[in-house]
């Protein structure tokens, strides 16, 4: 901590300007009034202070606002934000999306830091839900943001926010996350017609149940293999050969290249070889003709 020393004569800062970059650390501490700094925070960013000088300015703000900075100061922190610890940020009450954008801009191009993660957490908790504008902003800065959230956190995303989600935002989501997002997408897009609906829902289908896939197979959607490979294995298994053929349309030929990978491999094992042969793709590994198929899971459920 910087020692308390009197400000030399004539050095008392009247405003935050470039002359301050020539001040030593102790002079900044002694000669810059914290209240002046708070009201002129927007100027700090334009001045090439050293990291050591920024430490002094932060210290002054900490003394002035021991309970946490007001939003009027937070919004203009600029590069001083990089000096904040998650503990500092937990004291803040950030409600303005403009403030959030300003601080995310400072960290742009870098991985999400603990400070940014804390800031986002505080902001979303303050809003009570992850609304569309917030989601738009966060995914613009961090495309993987949505998939970094736990299923519990994702439950606060209202269906209306799903319109802001782009396919690339879901690239790293696992099935548990898609289980939460898919029903929201299903609700959000339900007023669209068949082909438009499929375009929007496609990236969320890794969370779809069997019956929805069966229904989609009646809609001539022509699902691509990349989407099919991301479907839940247990949702694909009950589909018949005819249903998969309808679901994939012209892309059904791609099954051959994927026959050793899940969910195609497991699905093949559940189909009668006779039925697989009707596809004319040379898929092997189905149930031989004449064998009786017992669905043990159903037996268990019925007993």
């Amino acid at each position: 901590e910087v020692e308390k020393t009197a400000c030399p004569s004539g050095k008392k800062a009247r405003e935050i300007d470039e002359s301050l970059i020539f001040y030593k650390k102790w002079e900044l501490e002694a000669c810059v009034d914290a209240a002046l700094l708070a009201t002129q925070m927007d100027r700090v960013n334009a001045i090439p202070f050293t990291y050591e000088q920024l430490d002094v300015l932060k210290h002054k703000l900490d003394e002035l606002y021991p309970q946490g900075y007001p939003e009027s100061v937070i919004q203009h922190l600029g590069y001083l934000f990089l000096k904040m610890s998650p503990e500092d940020i937990r004291k803040w009450n950030v409600t303005s999306l403009e403030t959030l954008k300003a601080l995310l801009e400072v960290n742009k191009g870098h991985e999400m830091s603990p400070q940014v993660a804390t800031l986002i957490d505080r902001f979303v908790k303050g809003r009570g839900q992850l609304d569309k504008d917030t989601l738009d902003t966060l995914t613009a800065f961090y495309p993987g943001y949505l998939c970094s959230l736990s299923p519990e956190e994702l439950s606060s995303v209202p269906p209306s926010s799903i319109w802001a989600v782009r396919p690339q935002d879901l690239d790293t989501c696992d099935p548990r996350q898609l289980d939460v997002l898919y029903p929201k997408a299903r609700l959000a897009f339900q007023n669209m017609n068949g082909s438009e609906y499929f375009v929007k829902i496609q990236s969320f289908l890794g969370g779809a149940p069997t019956e929805d896939l069966k229904a989609l197979s009646q809609q001539n959607v022509s699902m691509d293999l990349a989407t099919f490979m991301k479907l839940r294995t247990d949702a694909v298994l009950p589909l018949t050969v005819a249903e998969v053929q309808k679901l994939l349309g012209p892309h059904v030929e791609g099954l051959k290249a994927e026959e050793r990978h899940r969910p195609v491999r497991d699905w093949i094992l559940r189909q009668r070889q006779d039925d697989l042969d009707t596809l004319g793709l040379g898929l092997q590994g189905g149930i031989p003709n004449g064998y009786l198929v017992l669905d043990l899971s159903m037996q268990e459920a019925l007993s």
């Epitope: 299923p151 439950s155 269906p159 209306s160 099935p175 548990r176 289980d179 939460v180 029903p183 299903r186 609700l187 897009f189 339900q190 007023n191 068949g194 609906y197 829902i201 969370g207 149940p209 069997t210 019956e211 929805d212 069966k214 229904a215 989609l216 809609q219 247990d234 949702a235 009950p238 899971s297 159903m298 459920a301 019925l302």
Partner: antibody, heavy 122, light 107 residues
Framework: QVQLQESGPGLVKPSETLSLTCTVS????????WSWVRQPPGKGLEWIGY???????NSNPSLKSRVIISVDTSKNQFSLKLSSVTAADTAVYYC????????????????WGRGTLVTVSS | EIVMTQSPATLSVSPGERATLSCRAS??????LAWYQQKPGQAPRLLIY???TRATGIPARFSGSGSGTEFTLTISSLQSEDFAVYYC?????????FGQGTRLEIK
């Protein structure tokens, strides 16, 4: 043909936890979303929440803090726990299946259990 | 949440006549509306979804219309088995909400 059957105590004391189970027979629990809906005597219907077989849930905000919905795929069952009950929670509780094959989208119910009356009283 | 209001609370109609039940939403639900019939001691039964599409096995005398905030269930020629309580339900947004019901009784 798929059938639903609710089971659980018919009487629960105030401040205790109401626990009900819905058994799905004649079909797999994995294919649909499953909901709980309740109806106080002589009143209308209130949606409590749904569950997917993976365990993913969504509940009515008016009850969220007191509701836990869970699933046991090995038994083809899903359950409801409602904590800190009061007389206002006295109702017939139904389990229901969210519609499947009728449409790709739609959160309404094409199959219902017969319902079970739960009375909250000391 | 979206509040669904049904009217009238009770409707008295003679067998063979037409019954018209109304349901109003506090904000637009597009066509995301279902109608159910409930008889004493029974679970509700799905009649209509998508505001106007009859569910499997529902007789043609039941028809639904409307979109946005105003919806109607019409039973063209009442049969004795049609006297029951009817509920509308919106599924445009969560939480899913139901109307308070209209009791259809024999006049």
């Amino acid at each position: 043909q798929v059938q639903l059957q609710e089971s659980g105590p018919g009487l629960v004391k105030p401040s205790e936890t109401l626990s009900l189970t819905c058994t799905v027979s004649g079909g797999s629990i994995q294919n649909y979303y499953w909901s709980w809906v309740r109806q106080p005597p002589g009143k209308g219907l209130e949606w409590i929440g749904y569950i997917f077989y993976s365990g993913s849930t969504n509940s009515n905000p008016s009850l969220k803090s007191r509701v836990i919905i869970s699933v046991d795929t090995s038994k083809n069952q899903f359950s409801l726990k409602l904590s800190s009950v009061t007389a206002a929670d006295t109702a017939v509780y139904y389990c229901a299946r969210e519609v499947g094959r009728i449409a790709v989208a739609g959160w309404f119910f094409d199959l219902w259990g017969r319902g079970t009356l739960v009375t909250v009283s000391s | 949440e979206i509040v669904m209001t049904q009217s009238p609370a009770t409707l008295s109609v003679s067998p063979g006549e037409r019954a018209t039940l109304s349901c109003r939403a506090s904000q637009s639900v597009n066509s995301n509306l279902a109608w159910y019939q409930q008889k004493p001691g029974q679970a509700p039964r799905l009649l209509i979804y998508g505001a106007s599409t009859r569910a499997t096995g529902i007789p043609a005398r039941f028809s639904g219309s409307g979109s946005g905030t105003e919806f109607t269930l019409t039973i063209s020629s009442l049969q004795s088995e049609d006297f029951a309580v009817y509920y509308c339900q919106q599924y445009n947004n969560w939480p899913l909400t139901f109307g308070q019901g209209t009791r259809l009784e024999i006049k």
